[in-house]
Amino acid sequence: SEVEYRAEVGQNAYLPCFYTPAAPGNLVPVCWGKGACPVFECGNVVLRTDERDVNYWTSRYWLNGDFRKGDVSLTIENVTLADSGIYCCRIQIPGIMNDEKFNLKLVIK
């Protein structure tokens, strides 16, 4: 079952997601998607990072923390009721079936 997070209409929502880089700056790809995590990757991607930087994002979605240190928590700006639902944070640690995936439930009031 998903961990639940709450925010109010018009405020920013915060969905935490973290990993520990093997070494400082040794980043791994991360994707955030609207909807539960599928078998691979993310569905309906709202933001993604690669080994260096944030390389894809859509409006209102951003990383507020220091993603170079593994803080890939998602901030959603100025939320509406339509932002309610499940979000997937997937940390694509290289190797054989090494992904870490987290489904987070956002409730907007």
Epitope: P29, G33, G35, A36, P38, V39, F40, E41, C42, G43, N44, V45, R48, Y56, Q92, I93, P94, G95, I96, M97, N98, D99
Partner: antibody, heavy 121, light 107 residues
């Protein structure tokens, strides 16, 4: 246009090895996940392996894990499947397929024509 | 593993008929279901993903619906080229699994 061409199939004895290749053209190969899917003689489809666009992450079902290895050479636009310790139940038509992922993961939007692998003594 | 149970296994119909194929998942798969068409001697061709989104170039007579555990593929008016085998697949969790197929034959 998108083209995927498998090769390397054939007849192999139980316990043997085989390496399949899939040559890709008509799209930016390094921008897609890629998969192998097989179709058994009774026409059932089975997912075999998937690899990320960079090749850094790989995924397998338990039935082939530790026996099959998926890999890719983005410079050569080629996908591979190294198969070892082959069993009779691995007899199938093997297809490679493309998996878009960047804005939305979608499984297998283009398939090759397949290469036949027969495991028999 | 998630089992995708497809029904019917065989279906006889005529050109112009409306047909529906069903796929039931043994566990919740959200809308992570795809549908494929396979003609004899050919590779599978994708029709639908995300349960209801048609791939580019797929005729509008093909439609998908459902969420959770029950999914349907509907062909609104069968054309001669639609007689083929159809497979569903779930891509919600590993391993990705396919249904057993529905062979659509000319009555």
């Amino acid at each position: 246009q998108v083209q995927l061409q498998e090769s390397g199939g054939g007849l192999v004895k139980p316990g043997g090895s085989l390496k399949l290749s899939c040559a890709a053209s008509g799209f930016t190969f390094s921008s897609y996940y890629m998969s192998w899917v097989r179709q058994t003689p009774d026409k059932r489809l089975e997912w075999v392996a998937t690899i990320s666009n960079s090749g850094g992450s790989t995924y397998y079902p338990d039935s082939v894990k530790d026996r099959f290895t998926i890999s890719r050479d983005n410079a050569k636009n080629t996908l591979y499947l190294q198969m070892s310790s082959l069993k009779s139940e691995d007899t199938a038509m093997y297809y490679c397929a493309r998996d878009p992922y960047y804005t939305n993961y979608v499984p297998m939007d283009y398939w090759g024509q397949g290469t036949m692998v027969t495991v028999s003594s | 593993d998630i089992v995708m149970t497809q029904s019917p296994s065989f279906l006889s119909a005529s050109v112009g008929d409306r047909v529906t194929i069903t796929c039931k998942a043994s566990q919740y798969v959200d809308t992570y279901v795809a549908w494929y068409q396979q003609r004899p001697g050919k590779a599978p061709k994708p029709l639908i993903y995300s349960a209801s989104t048609r791939h580019t170039g797929v005729p509008s007579r093909f439609s998908g619906s459902g969420s959770g555990t029950e999914f349907t593929l509907t062909i609104s008016s069968l054309q001669p080229e639609d007689f083929a085998t159809y497979f569903c697949a779930q891509y919600s969790s590993s391993p990705l699994t396919f249904g057993g197929g529905t062979k659509l034959e000319l009555k």
